[in-house]
């Protein structure tokens, strides 16, 4: 991975589009830290394992949390 | 459309300082990390420095460090190069490139809007 | 720090004609952080390939990409006339810093 200590943030751009709850690998929330200062939110798609940085602050991204949470939800006992 | 507009090149003497500038069009600028690269007269490409989307990080070639510097002003969709003690070495036609929606430091979705570039000559 | 090399320098092919470049890094590369891009004379860079093997928006299938570790490749199935042009291989490094590769020219024979 292409990381040095400097870097502060995984995110170099954010993304606003929407994303398929079904195409879904993984949905990461790394909460703001002394390294990051912000919420970033990293989801990783089922196709070719790509990653893609999400802007937390769009209104489609906070849909797509709230579903998978529900998805969650059903889920668990 | 999705647009970048680079301006601010010229004619300027060794040691001297300019700055350019990127005005973004046609998409959230705020959203994405934003680069600078060169490329001096009939030769290949050189990445010259990278901006994260808030500017939280920013990154140089080693050939620029201490002399330039990236900024950006999300307000005004631009971004900015200040280039100080200029050498001949750095006269190239200098662009400025949007990186792609979602690209961090696990997936690198590429450089994928360019301005047309603005030429910066160094010489006496 | 990687050091990208190109190959052929240029490659002189006809229209119609499969083009295959090649580009080698001197040390591994992960696939998600090798691009191409595409530049014709006097005008900037066009993204063509991102992780090694997806097409950017736009780009046409008869381009695509291959590879892992320290080689890649960037295939033209049938060379089209607005095709001639310099191709250049980039990857995103530690530090972090954005290599280019030196560039193949194709041109037409």
């Known amino acids: 991975v292409p990381l040095s200590r400097t870097v502060r943030c995984t995110c170099i751009s954010i993304s606003n589009q929407p994303v398929n709850p079904r195409s879904l690998e993984k949905l990461e929330i790394i909460p703001a830290s002394q390294f990051c200062p912000r919420v970033e939110i990293i989801a990783t798609m089922k196709k070719k394992g790509e990653k893609r940085c999400l802007n937390p602050e769009s209104k489609a991204i906070k849909n797509l949390l709230k579903a998978v949470s529900k998805e969650r939800s059903k889920r668990s006992p | 459309q999705m647009q970048l507009v680079e301006s601010g090149g010229g004619v300027v003497q060794p040691g001297r300082s300019l700055r350019l500038s990127c005005t973004a069009s046609g998409f959230t600028f705020s959203n994405n990390g934003m680069h600078w690269v060169r490329q001096a007269p009939g030769k290949g490409l050189e990445w010259v420095a990278v901006i994260w989307f808030d500017g939280m990080n920013k990154f140089y070639v080693d050939s620029v460090k201490g002399r330039f510097t990236i900024s950006r002003d999300n307000s005004k969709n631009t971004l900015y190069l200040e280039m100080n003690s200029l050498r001949a070495e750095d006269t190239a036609i200098y662009y400025c490139?949007?990186?792609?929606?979602?690209?961090?430091?696990?997936?690198?979705?590429?450089?994928?809007?360019w301005g047309q570039g603005t030429t910066v000559t160094v010489g006496l | 720090e990687i050091v990208l090399t190109q190959s052929p320098g240029t490659l002189s092919l006809s229209p119609g004609e499969r083009a295959t470049l090649s580009c080698r890094a001197s040390q591994s590369v992960s696939s998600s952080y090798l691009a191409w891009y595409q530049q014709k004379p006097g005008q900037a860079p066009r993204l063509l390939i991102y992780?090694?093997?997806s097409r950017a928006t736009g780009i046409p299938d008869r381009f695509s990409g291959s590879g892992s570790g320290t080689d890649f490749t960037l295939t033209i199935s049938r060379l089209e006339p607005e095709d001639f042009a310099v191709y250049y291989c980039q990857q995103y490094g530690s530090s972090p810093i954005f290599t280019f590769g030196p560039g193949t020219k194709v041109d037409i024979k």
């Open positions: 992780g090694a093997s």
């Open positions: 490139a949007r990186e792609g929606d979602g690209s961090g430091i696990y997936y690198y979705y590429g450089m994928d809007v």
